[in-house]
């Protein structure tokens, strides 16, 4: 579990207890057995939005 008092990971990422970091859920595409991928299954990835002038 994430350490108490730390901010939750932003959308599209999930906490890795192994690495002590918020990891991009995109990693789970190739490495689905990483510890944080369980958290990714519950949260859809953040959509990427192009910023037009």
């Amino acid at each position: 579990e994430q350490a108490p008092g730390t901010a939750p990971c932003s959308r599209g990422s999930s906490w890795s207890a192994d690495l002590d970091k918020c990891m991009d859920c995109a990693s789970c595409r190739a490495r689905p057995h990483s510890d944080f991928c369980l958290g990714c299954a519950a949260a859809p990835p953040a959509p990427f939005r192009l910023l037009w002038p």
């Epitope: 990891m23 991009d24 990693s27 490495r31 990483s34 510890d35 990835p45 990427f48």
Partner: antibody, heavy 125, light 113 residues
């Protein structure tokens, strides 16, 4: 600083098994993926497979029936076994760590940032 | 498997010149959810192990001189050395890690005139 060192026999007979060890010194072992890559004479590089400290693996389908990658977290070591070798398996074998980098507080795998020095394995009768 | 093609296979330049080399993937290695290209560039000097130069197509690894620049997206990528030094003599490989099996290009050998 993390350092990796490959070890194993430099000569293997055809049809036998090739077994290599990669020892990881310094840094964290958990959470990272640890890879085996080989470089054939002529310099072509081939990713063979990877493992994490939990024993989860990805392997190159071209080797799937012959390759086994295992880990010993108590010793910070991981291992390669390649069965039924032929002269085509003659290569320099490297172990490497898949690095992790962050952008705006979100981290992701970012390429093999630490490599061993490589060990030449010759398959010959 | 995602096939990676590099060109040219070799090139010879003088110290101080600008160099560009190309890497193309058979299919896109851009992941739309985070807009990252899962492409790395490695430098392998004679007798040494490969060294990570660039990841995510354009991010320099810590300690890599800023004369090395990675660019491109989707299927077409470029490594540029703005002003070549003698120590840049090496083979440069691209690699995709968008999906397994992770695959390498055949390399571009940089020679110094």
């Amino acid at each position: 600083d993390v350092q990796l060192q490959e070890s194993g026999p430099g000569l293997v007979k055809p049809s036998q098994s090739l077994s290599l060890t990669c020892a990881v010194y310094g840094g964290s072992f958990s959470g990272y993926y640890w890879s085996w890559i080989r470089q054939f004479p002529g310099n072509k590089l081939e990713w063979m497979g990877e493992i994490n400290h939990r024993g989860s693996t990805n392997s190159n389908p071209s080797l799937k029936s012959r390759i086994s990658i295992t880990v010993d977290t108590s010793k910070n070591q991981f291992f390669l076994q390649l069965n039924s070798v032929t002269t085509e398996d003659t290569a320099t074998y490297y172990c490497a760590r898949e690095g992790i980098s962050g952008s705006m507080g979100i981290y992701d795998y970012s390429g093999m940032d630490v490599w061993g020095q490589g060990t030449l394995v010759t398959v010959s009768a | 498997d995602i096939v990676m093609s590099q060109s040219p296979s070799s090139l010879a330049v003088s110290v101080g010149e600008k160099v560009t080399m190309s890497c193309k993937s058979r299919q896109s290695i851009l992941y739309s959810s985070n807009n990252k290209n899962y492409l790395t560039w490695y430098q392998q000097k004679p007798g040494q192990s490969p060294k990570l130069l660039i990841y995510w197509a354009s991010t320099r690894e810590s300690g890599v001189p800023d004369r090395f620049t990675g660019s491109g997206s989707g299927t077409d990528f470029t490594l540029t050395i703005s002003s070549v030094k003698a120590e840049d003599l090496a083979v440069y490989y691209c690699q995709q890690y968008y999906s397994t099996p992770y695959t390498f290009g055949s390399g571009t050998k940089l020679e110094i005139k």
